[in-house]
Interface confidence: low
């Protein structure tokens, strides 16, 4: 039975060529976590194996670092950059467990964090 | 544990096609994140095409795009290659694996390190 949830920094907004943490928090659970995938709608940004340790898609390493923790930081960013992020959270016994956070990166100088929610 | 067998590959001249099958038996799901690789000798091995079982959703290299469709058949529990318009830079040992913990989307290539399970690989030659 999957009890956790997934805690996650909601909706984001961040300027351009700026940076942003996307973070996930997995909690009520005593799951271990084997691999945490990042990815931006169809594409694979970055892993985080409990065993290999992190890897960076290489379309993505000049823009990309790991950290903090399991988290991602997105470096340089773009009006491209603009949509949904994932992080999965691979876990034994649970199974998978997913988060979702919208970014906007926004031309001015306007930038304001969303409100932290949950994913059951 | 789930055992995957490859088979279709052969040789065919340039422009021919190929359909290679993956073959999954023992504990597999309804949600299964299969990925077609291939491995040409003194090269590193690349990612082809993926299929996560259960959405349909597909991803392929650039490399390939337009010409190769990876497909399902869930009654077989088999995942399909078909390669049209194949080049002789297609000439490669084919492999299938398989994600012990599918991802919801992307492109997990990375040299294949984070699949689980892998196939014993199929031949293709493509000759000019």
């Known amino acids: 039975m999957m009890t956790g949830t997934i805690e996650t920094t909601g909706n984001i907004s961040a300027e351009k060529g700026g940076s942003i943490i996307l973070q996930c928090h997995l909690s009520s659970t005593t799951a271990q976590v084997t691999q945490v995938n990042w990815e931006q709608q169809d594409q694979l940004l970055a892993i985080c194996n409990a065993d290999l340790g992190w890897h960076i898609s290489p379309s993505f390493k000049d823009r990309v670092a790991p950290g903090p923790g399991l988290g991602l930081t997105l470096q340089s960013l773009t009006v491209n950059d603009t949509g949904e992020y994932f992080c999965i959270y691979h876990t034994y016994p649970d199974g998978t467990y997913t988060g979702r956070i919208f970014l906007e990166v926004l031309e001015s100088s306007v930038a304001e964090h969303g409100a932290r929610f949950q994913i059951p | 544990q789930v055992q995957l067998a490859e088979s279709g590959g052969g040789s065919v001249q340039t422009g021919g096609s190929l359909r290679l099958s993956c073959a999954a038996s023992?504990?597999?799901?309804?949600?299964?994140?299969v990925a077609w690789f291939r491995q040409a000798p003194g090269k590193e091995r690349e990612g082809v095409a993926r299929?996560?079982?259960?959405?349909?959703?597909?991803y392929y290299a650039d490399s390939v795009k337009g010409r190769f469709i990876i497909s399902q058949d869930n009654a077989k529990n088999t995942v399909y290659l078909q390669m049209n318009t194949l080049k002789p830079e297609d000439t490669a040992m084919y492999y299938c694996a398989e994600e012990l913990a599918p991802a919801r989307s992307g492109g997990i290539w990375f040299g294949g390190r984070y699949f689980s399970y892998w196939g014993q690989g199929t031949q293709v030659t493509v000759s000019s």
């Open positions: 299929l996560i079982t259960d959405s349909g959703s597909t």
């Open positions: 023992g504990n597999t799901g309804s949600r299964r994140y």
